[in-house]
């Protein structure tokens, strides 16, 4: 097992004439990142092959924004190195292909946009163990500068990282049936690695990373002593009372689950069911990618499919958190003005506006009277976000178009009567009142309670209202 | 090569369940999620769910909660979509697809299909 | 749900010939969005991906192309093997969702 390391130095136009333009801009800022897959053999293998050796996602760069009128430079590297762990042998010789990717950072209501800037591809002999090699590729008119390695994990040495080696424990000497480890011949051939945590008791390998358990143990690393199964119950009762062995702890006794992990109890064995950020058999693994989907509710992952790489989710509208997993309460924010109610559709917020109010979040002051006539002479009169026509004599309705009754509402009192005339109404008034409405009484005496009647008209005559 | 291998044709009886097979190779199974998806003979096609086989975790089509279990089997490298309480309406091509894990997301191999046929 | 509308439905067309389908989504989704081609009877197959990347052993013929909501594949001189149905898939938010998809004919 190992590491190849890739070191992107530089990444930026090439030279000779037809400089390609920054791929960034101030309306539209972006930055780079990295992918590499690596394919073993120098056979000129189909495109769409498998990255058979390993793929890894570099982190963002710098956001870069171009300045105007300025030639593209080289643009602002992601730091660290990509690294793409290899479980088995080095091949020795492996195919490359490492793309550059730009992430435009504009607007976000979509998530981020990314689009391929240039992909260079090669054929390459590598010892693992030796010193960084250096390249350079070019891709249309862009030029990546970078070095690589492939190093192996202790205690893998050697030019494919198959001999397992470990310092001497005596200076003289290897231990029984252990060879030097040339050329570093300070160390010795190590017997097989287990599993890690394969108990030293109980359990053996023929096989490097195994873990097999002697008779009477299971459980993934031969830690659980196998109960027998012709008591009556897992737990019981003891051998006095039915003659069968007592059986050892249950597999989840003590809790053999990291990390908040629950144990559940299989026929076999015992399962973890393990908390967000963790797997593994006993959820000791944290190292949570992509690969494990935690980007709820249609997140985008963005991040490496290797153990150690980190993720980030970029939520879509209407959730939050590190893992897209709060739906957000964007109704609370109170974003709908002038009394419009909030609906919160999960992929879009929208507001019901009040009448008189219109826009995405009502935010508009509608002009009741913009574009509305009021007929018939009549004026419009706003107010409460609904429009009004204060209507001429003779003519009511919404927009004053319907002719009115001017009798309807009985406007002559004390039992006057009502003439509807083209000007308006007409009371004639009952005996002893006078008034355009009949409303004043005609005292005893013959005076009236208004002033003397306008020449040419006697009390009782009807009274016209203009 | 990538290659998605599902199980044969099946015919079932209505109200019964069904358990669809995609066997995946060429690949590590656990770097990659499995989508399932349904087509209806000369329809269109639909997203029923995902599954990520390295942590079991699933993400659905809610048209499909209830109906529609995605599984997986690191072991055999085989991914499963059981079909519950069969009816007409399920009759359909059920195809395995595999799905990048970061974004940009894509199905860029799919298995060849399988066909349930739901009838009394 | 984002709803993925396609157009046209169906046409057709002659070899040679230069087609651009389209697809709208009802929400923007940036450049999450693939393209794919399904023959009669096969299952489908990744043209482009990230709205504008051509998919590995794709031919350059095919070009995908758009953002926000409005997206684009346009084949140019169609080939006798190009013909079958074409379909979009947005990747913003759940579910993601195909458009209705575009059945291309030969004349």
């Known amino acids: 097992a190992g590491v190849f390391e890739l070191q992107i130095h530089s990444f930026g136009p090439g030279p000779g004439p037809g400089a390609p333009r920054s791929p960034c801009s101030a309306r539209l800022p972006c930055r780079l990142f990295f992918r590499v897959c690596l394919k073993p053999g120098l056979s000129e293998e189909a495109a769409e092959s498998p990255c058979a050796l390993g793929a890894a996602l570099s982190a963002r760069g710098p956001v870069y924004t171009e300045q105007p009128g300025a030639p593209a430079p080289d643009l602002p590297l992601p730091d660290g190195l990509l690294q793409v762990p290899f479980r088995d042998a080095w091949p020795g010789t492996f195919s490359f292909i490492i793309e550059t990717w730009r992430e435009e950072l504009g607007d976000q209501i979509g998530g981020p946009a990314w689009s391929l800037l240039a992909r260079v591809a090669g054929r390459r002999r590598l010892a693992a163990g030796g010193p960084w090699a250096r390249d350079i590729q070019r891709a249309g008119a862009w030029e990546l500068r970078f070095s690589y390695r492939a190093r192996c994990e202790p205690p893998a040495v050697g030019t494919a990282c198959t001999r397992l080696c470990r310092p001497r424990s005596a200076p003289s000497r290897c231990g029984p049936g252990l060879r030097p480890c040339a050329p570093l011949e300070d160390e010795c051939e190590a017997p097989l690695v287990c599993r890690a945590g394969c108990s030293p008791e109980h359990g053996f390998c023929e096989q490097p990373g195994e873990c097999r358990c002697l008779e009477g143990w299971t459980g993934p690393l031969c830690t659980v002593p196998v109960s027998t199964s012709s008591c009556l119950s897992p737990r019981g009762p003891s051998s006095a009372t039915t003659g069968c062995l007592v059986p050892g702890p249950g597999p989840c006794d003590g809790n053999p689950c990291a990390n908040g992990g629950s144990c559940s109890e299989t026929p076999r064995s015992f399962e973890c069911t393990c908390p967000r950020g963790f797997y593994g058999l006993r959820c000791e693994v944290s190292g949570v990618t992509c690969a494990d989907g935690p980007c709820f509710n249609g997140g985008l992952c963005v991040g490496g499919a290797d153990p150690d790489s980190a993720y980030i989710c970029h939520c879509p509208p209407g959730f939050q958190g590190s893992n897209c997993e709060k739906r957000v309460d964007r109704c609370s924010l109170q974003p709908c003005r002038n009394g419009g109610l909030c609906l919160d559709l999960g992929h879009a917020l929208r507001c019901r506006c009040r009448a008189g109010f219109a826009g995405p979040r009502c935010e508009h002051d509608l002009d009741d009277c913009a574009g509305r006539a009021c007929a018939n002479g009549g004026t419009c009169v706003e107010g409460g976000g609904a429009h009004r026509c204060s209507c001429a004599l003779g003519f009511g309705g919404r927009d004053c178009r319907e002719r009115a009754d001017p009798c309807a509402a009985r406007p002559c009192a004390h039992g006057g009567r009502c003439y509807a005339h083209f000007s308006g109404l007409v009371c004639a008034c009952a005996p002893g009142y006078m008034g355009a409405r009949c409303e004043f009484p005609v005292h005893p005496d013959g005076a009236s309670a208004l002033p003397a009647a306008p020449p040419g008209l006697r009390p009782g005559d009807p009274q016209r209202y203009l | 090569q990538v290659q998605l291998q599902q199980s044969g044709a099946e015919l079932a009886r209505p109200g019964a369940s069904m358990k669809l097979s995609c066997k995946a190779s060429?690949?590590?199974?656990?770097?990659?999620?499995i989508s399932w998806v349904k087509q209806i003979t000369g329809q269109g096609l639909e997203w029923i769910g995902e599954?990520?086989?390295?942590?079991?975790?699933?993400y659905d089509n809610e048209n499909f909660r209830g109906k529609a279990t995605l599984t997986a089997d690191k072991s055999s490298s085989t991914a499963y979509l059981e079909v519950r309480s069969l009816t007409s309406e399920d009759s359909a091509v059920y195809f395995c697809?595999?799905?990048?894990?970061?974004?940009?997301?894509?199905?860029?191999?799919w298995g060849q299909g399988t066909t349930l046929t739901v009838s009394s | 749900d984002i709803q993925m509308t396609q157009s046209p439905a169906s046409l057709s067309v002659s070899v040679g010939e230069t087609v651009t389908i389209t697809c709208r989504a009802s929400?923007?989704?940036?450049?999450?969005l693939a393209w794919y081609q399904q023959k009669q009877g096969k299952s489908p197959q990744l043209l482009v991906y990230?709205?504008?990347n051509l998919a590995d052993g794709v031919p350059s013929r095919f070009s995908g192309s758009g953002s926000g909501t409005q997206f684009s594949l346009k084949i140019s001189g169609l080939q006798s093997e190009d013909f079958g149905s074409y379909y979009c898939?947005?990747?913003?938010?759940?579910?993601?969702?195909f458009g209705g998809g575009t059945k291309l004919e030969i004349r």
């Open positions: 697809a595999r799905t990048t894990v970061f974004a940009p997301y894509y199905f860029d191999y």
């Open positions: 060429g690949y590590t199974f656990t770097s990659y999620g």
């Open positions: 599954i990520f086989p390295r942590s079991g975790n699933t």
């Open positions: 929400e923007n989704i940036n450049s999450n």
């Open positions: 990230a709205a504008t």
């Open positions: 898939q947005h990747f913003w938010g759940l579910p993601w969702t």
